[in-house]
Interface confidence: medium
């Protein structure tokens, strides 16, 4: 079976790399536009130049192309805590990231939010905070991990996952409760 190609891919594959097939005349291969530019007019004939124009402010193309319009620059989402790492240029989109001591949490493929790295209070750092992952903490004795924070075993209820880690403390609490009732 031959894999299905879209019309544009089909047309491009007939021409050598760096060229595309003229949309009105499939015997002509036009040179693609450089990154930072877009297609204003197709080449008039073989060996003639494609009319490429530079992207306007607020738009870009990051690779050679035959797009009729440049792509709009992304905006960093301030309400997600994002900051601009580098501004948009004609040949590169805006790069957004997080502040120091924060990590990216991806809600979906194209949406991330910046969160503060856990400090591992009442515990130790098992794995340092990374660009896309929070610190991994190991808790001291008498504490258990809940939502990546070390919480005192006094907050451990019997129904929670913490019961194994906090078993001695729970039994002590149970013992004091039992001794007060007759």
């Amino acid at each position: 079976l031959v894999p299905h190609l879209g019309d544009r891919e089909k047309r491009d594959s007939v021409c050598p790399q760096g060229k595309y097939i003229h949309p009105q005349n499939n015997s002509i291969c036009c040179t693609k536009c450089h990154k930072g530019t877009y297609l204003y007019n197709d080449c008039p004939g073989p060996g003639q130049d494609t009319d490429c124009r530079e992207c306007e402010s607020g738009s870009f193309t990051a690779s050679e192309n035959h797009l009729r319009h440049c792509l709009s620059c992304s905006k960093c989402r301030k309400e997600m805590g994002q900051v601009e790492i580098s501004s948009c240029t004609v040949d590169r989109d805006t790069v957004c990231g997080c502040r120091k001591n924060q990590y990216r949490h991806y809600w979906s493929e194209n949406l991330f939010q910046c969160f503060n790295c856990s400090l591992c209070l009442n515990g130790t750092v098992h794995l340092s905070c990374q660009e896309k992952q929070n610190t991994v903490c190991t808790c001291h004795a008498g504490f258990f991990l809940r939502e990546n924070e070390c919480v005192s075993c006094s907050n451990c209820k019997k129904s929670l996952e913490c019961t194994k880690l906090c078993l001695p403390q729970i039994e002590n609490v149970k013992g004091t409760e039992d001794s007060g009732t007759t």
Partner: nanobody, 121 residues
């Protein structure tokens, strides 16, 4: 006082549709991103979808992409979630929430009380 009030939940058969609404008051609704989050019985919270303040940008968890559509009407201070092709695994309490906090994922400054969606034949 900030209030978020969800409605529209109920019992629906697999493959069916529901439209959830979230009526907001007590803050400038058109200035903030809004989210839908859900909690299935006996499970943790799961982020479902988000929409930008003006409604131009929408985001979806992979588990609902192509089936759910988030929208908002800023003139009515209302957030919506259109749920199509519902599956048993979509059974959960659905919450609308505003403004995520920076301390941890799924930490919001305000939540609604939730509306239960049950998908069962």
């Amino acid at each position: 006082e900030v209030q978020l009030l969800e409605s529209g939940g109920g019992l629906v058969q697999p493959g069916g549709s529901l439209r959830l609404s979230c009526a907001a008051s007590g803050f400038t609704f058109g200035n903030v991103d809004m989210h839908w989050v859900r909690q299935a019985p006996g499970k943790g919270l799961e982020w479902v979808s988000a929409i930008s303040s003006a409604g131009g940008e929408t985001y979806y968890a992979d588990s609902v992409k192509g089936r759910f559509t988030i929208s908002r009407d800023n003139s009515k201070n209302t957030l919506y979630l259109q749920m199509n092709s519902l599956r048993a695994e979509d059974t959960a309490v659905y919450y609308c929430a505003k403004r995520m906090l920076a301390n941890s994922p799924l930490a919001f400054d305000y939540w609604g009380q939730g509306t239960l969606v049950t998908v069962s034949s």
